[in-house]
């Protein structure tokens, strides 16, 4: 007999999601309009292509990357899409309200969709730590809280620290990782007896997870360059990200083999580490002047990622209840920090070179930005975790963790699909 969606959730989810969607439609009706200015089609197409790259990263890349569980692959992909669709809508409104609203209506441009997709990506990174342990109603709450927290963080950083879109969006890695880890910490941890097999990976879902990693790998240069303002900055960011992810792939595969007693390559390590370079150079991708530096960073990031994948899962599993194959949380927390530290090191080198106190002040500001991002991520993550523990969401029972049959209709009702 297949597990039925709990009756109360069947009543709660459609009502909650559709009410929210209706509210969003009303907000769009009253407060938004399209950018009506004249622009040539060629420029529009080029601008749209960047947004399209980001959407592919989010829907296919992150969707499939999280689909490696034996019994939870359908839910991983579809729930990611659901969160992306909802997150983009809310992020467009929120960014508009925070940045433009005093002037009247929120103007929607291709850039605002690009920005919103990146904000929604934050949720898809965070959710890796909790997928399989929450239902869609809970994920809706997570989307709303995280997108709101990230939007406000970016606005505060922009206003207080005087940083541009790229710099304040690149906190996304650290923010998303710590947000996801703190939510996971609040959720029920121990897997009951008899369900251990559900959080194991299987060959076909692992292959789809690798497909997700490949899509992310291909489009990571678009992500890192999407918010930069001039062709010279974007070109530099694309080159540096490409070199960094190229080196991190080589490092990931060889490092994974090195880390195994029999020299075998771990799928989990590779899924994660191929992206390491892209995350590590994110903040500084436009500032790095030569390929060799980007490649060194890719190498270091790949090694850190493999090392983290080897030693951190045990700790994460015990403390946070995160399964071994959900590696994005700790991976991005380490690599995001590495990326931020690299940027701070560049500022420190400026200080040493100039012997200038004001550049030292810039270093302090950057440390302040990073600290603020981590603090807001942890606080909003804990708040979300507490909210998700409320009984009204009818969270899946621990025995139903990592089980597609709780959420999906399978005509064959096979247990070992």
């Amino acid at each position: 007999m297949s597990s039925k969606y709990p009756r109360s959730v069947r009543r709660c989810l459609p009502l909650w999601a559709l009410t929210l969607e209706a509210a969003l439609i009303l907000l769009f009706y009253f407060f938004t309009h399209y950018d009506a200015s004249l622009e040539d089609q060629k420029g529009l197409v080029a601008s749209y292509q960047v947004g399209q790259d980001l959407t592919v990263m989010a829907a296919i890349g992150l969707g499939f990357l999280t689909s490696s569980f034996r019994r939870h692959s359908w839910s991983s992909v579809a729930f990611n899409l659901f969160m992306l669709a909802l997150g983009v809508q809310w992020a467009i409104l929120l960014d508009g309200f925070l940045s433009q609203f005093p002037s009247g209506k929120v103007v929607i441009t291709l850039f605002s969709i690009r920005l919103a997709t990146m904000s929604a990506l934050s949720v898809l990174i965070s959710v890796d730590a909790v997928l399989g342990k929450v239902n869609l109603a809970q994920l809706v709450v997570m989307v709303l809280v995280e997108v709101t927290a990230l939007g406000n963080l970016r606005m505060v950083i922009s206003n207080i620290f005087n940083t541009d879109y790229h710099m304040n969006m690149m906190h996304i890695y650290v923010f998303a990782a710590y947000f996801g880890l703190s939510v996971a910490w609040c959720l029920p941890k121990p897997l009951p007896e008899g369900t251990e097999d559900k959080d194991q990976t299987a060959t076909i879902p692992s292959l789809s997870a690798m497909l997700g990693a490949l899509f992310l790998w291909m489009f990571w240069p678009s992500f890192n360059s999407a918010l930069l303002r001039s062709p010279i900055e974007r070109k530099n960011a694309v080159f540096n990200t490409y070199y960094a992810v190229a080196v991190s792939v080589v490092t990931a595969i060889s490092g994974s083999s090195l880390a195994h007693p029999q020299g075998k390559i771990s799928k989990t390590y590779v899924h994660s580490a191929v992206l390491a370079g892209g995350v590590a150079v994110g903040t500084s991708c436009h500032l790095i002047p030569s390929p060799w530096l980007a490649m060194v960073l890719g190498l270091v990031a790949g090694l850190i990622s493999v090392g983290g994948a080897k030693y951190l899962p045990g700790c994460c599993n015990r403390v946070l209840g995160i399964p071994h194959s959900s590696i994005m949380g700790y991976n991005f927390s380490l690599l995001g920090l590495l990326g931020e530290i690299i940027y701070i090191v560049l500022l420190v080198l400026d200080t040493v070179g100039a012997g200038n106190g004001m550049i030292g002040f810039q270093v302090l500001l950057s440390i302040g930005e990073l600290s603020l991002a981590i603090v807001i991520a942890l606080m909003s993550g804990l708040l979300t975790g507490l909210l998700l523990n409320l009984k009204i969401w009818k969270a899946p029972h621990e025995a139903k963790y990592f089980d597609d049959q709780v959420f999906w209709k399978f005509p064959h009702l096979a247990v070992g699909f």
């Epitope: 622009e39 040539d40 420029g43 529009l44 080029a46 601008s47 960047v50 441009t109 291709l110 850039f111 690009r114 922009s158 206003n159 005087n162 940083t163 541009d164 879109y165 303002r229 001039s230 062709p231 010279i232 900055e233 530099n236 500084s284 436009h286 500032l287 790095i288 002047p289 030569s290 530096l293 560049l346 080198l349 400026d350 070179g353 004001m358 002040f361 810039q362 500001l365």
Partner: antibody
Framework: EVQLVESGGGVVQPGRSLRLSCAAS????????MHWVRQAPGKGLEWVAV????????YYADSVKGRFTISRDNSKNTLYLQMNSLRAEDTAVYYC??????????????????????WGKGTTVTVSS | EIVLTQSPGTLSLSPGERATLSCRAS???????LAWYQQKPGQAPRLLIY???SRATGIPDRFSGSGSGTDFTLTISRLEPEDFAVYYC?????????FGQGTKLEIK
């Protein structure tokens, strides 16, 4: 020769609209961000708006947000400023300016510079009843 | 929004003298994003200095810029008759631009 020529200025009543144009020549227009800057009679320079090289992003001074719209047509090498709900305080000479993005490098990092390196001669907008 | 305050408002000097114009920001500005412009009556502004200290193309070496953080200076080592004009500092930060109110350099 690199050149920017503004047009579309004139006398207009408060509350009405006006559209300024800026024709660019002598450089690859689609590679540069573009700005509008204004100068009220006897006053200093006031930045009005900027549009990125590909038209994907625009920023406005708080004093014009919601009333003015900057846009560009890269196929026509033209920059526009649509001014709605004009007020007496919008009376000024309006300049369009090219944004030059350049950089210098040390061994470990690049430094980017964004400056308005080429300016038009300006077009006068007078808002008066 | 960052406010730039220029001083003095008017500076009266003779040709051949050294002029020092100051620009103070209400909060720290990246040196990369600080520029100086010259404007003569009836003309459009002209870029002099960018990145706080780099001279624009075609600008004589008597013009120099310095400073970082919140305090920036434009120095004209030996004033020529054509240097008497209004000078503006300008910053870019968080995708917003602001100009100082200007310093008028006049012949004494």
């Amino acid at each position: 020769e690199v050149q920017l020529v503004e047009s579309g200025g004139g006398v207009v009543q408060p509350g009405r609209s006006l559209r300024l144009s800026c024709a660019a020549s002598g450089f690859t227009f689609s590679n540069h961000g573009m700005h509008w800057v204004r100068q009220a009679p006897g006053k200093g320079l006031e930045w009005v708006a900027v549009i990125w090289y590909d038209g994907s992003n625009k920023y406005y001074a708080d004093s014009v947000k919601g009333r003015f719209t900057i846009s560009r047509d890269n196929s026509k090498n033209t920059l526009y400023l649509q001014m709605n709900s004009l007020r007496a305080e919008d009376t000024a000479v309006y300049y369009c300016a090219r944004e030059m993005a350049s950089y210098s490098s040390s061994w470990y990092r690049r430094y980017y510079y964004y400056v308005m390196d080429v300016w038009g001669k300006g077009t006068t907008v007078t808002v008066s009843s | 929004e960052i406010v730039l305050t220029q001083s003095p408002g008017t500076l009266s000097l003779s040709p051949g003298e050294r002029a020092t114009l100051s620009c103070r920001a209400s909060q720290s500005v990246s040196s990369s994003y600080l520029a100086w412009y010259q404007q003569k009556p009836g003309q459009a502004p002209r870029l002099l200095i960018y990145g706080a200290s780099s001279r624009a193309t075609g600008i004589p070496d008597r013009f120099s810029g310095s400073g970082s953080g919140t305090d920036f200076t434009l120095t004209i080592s030996r004033l020529e008759p054509e240097d008497f004009a209004v000078y503006y500092c300008q910053q870019y930060g968080s995708s917003r631009y602001t100009f100082g109110q200007g310093t008028k350099l006049e012949i004494k």
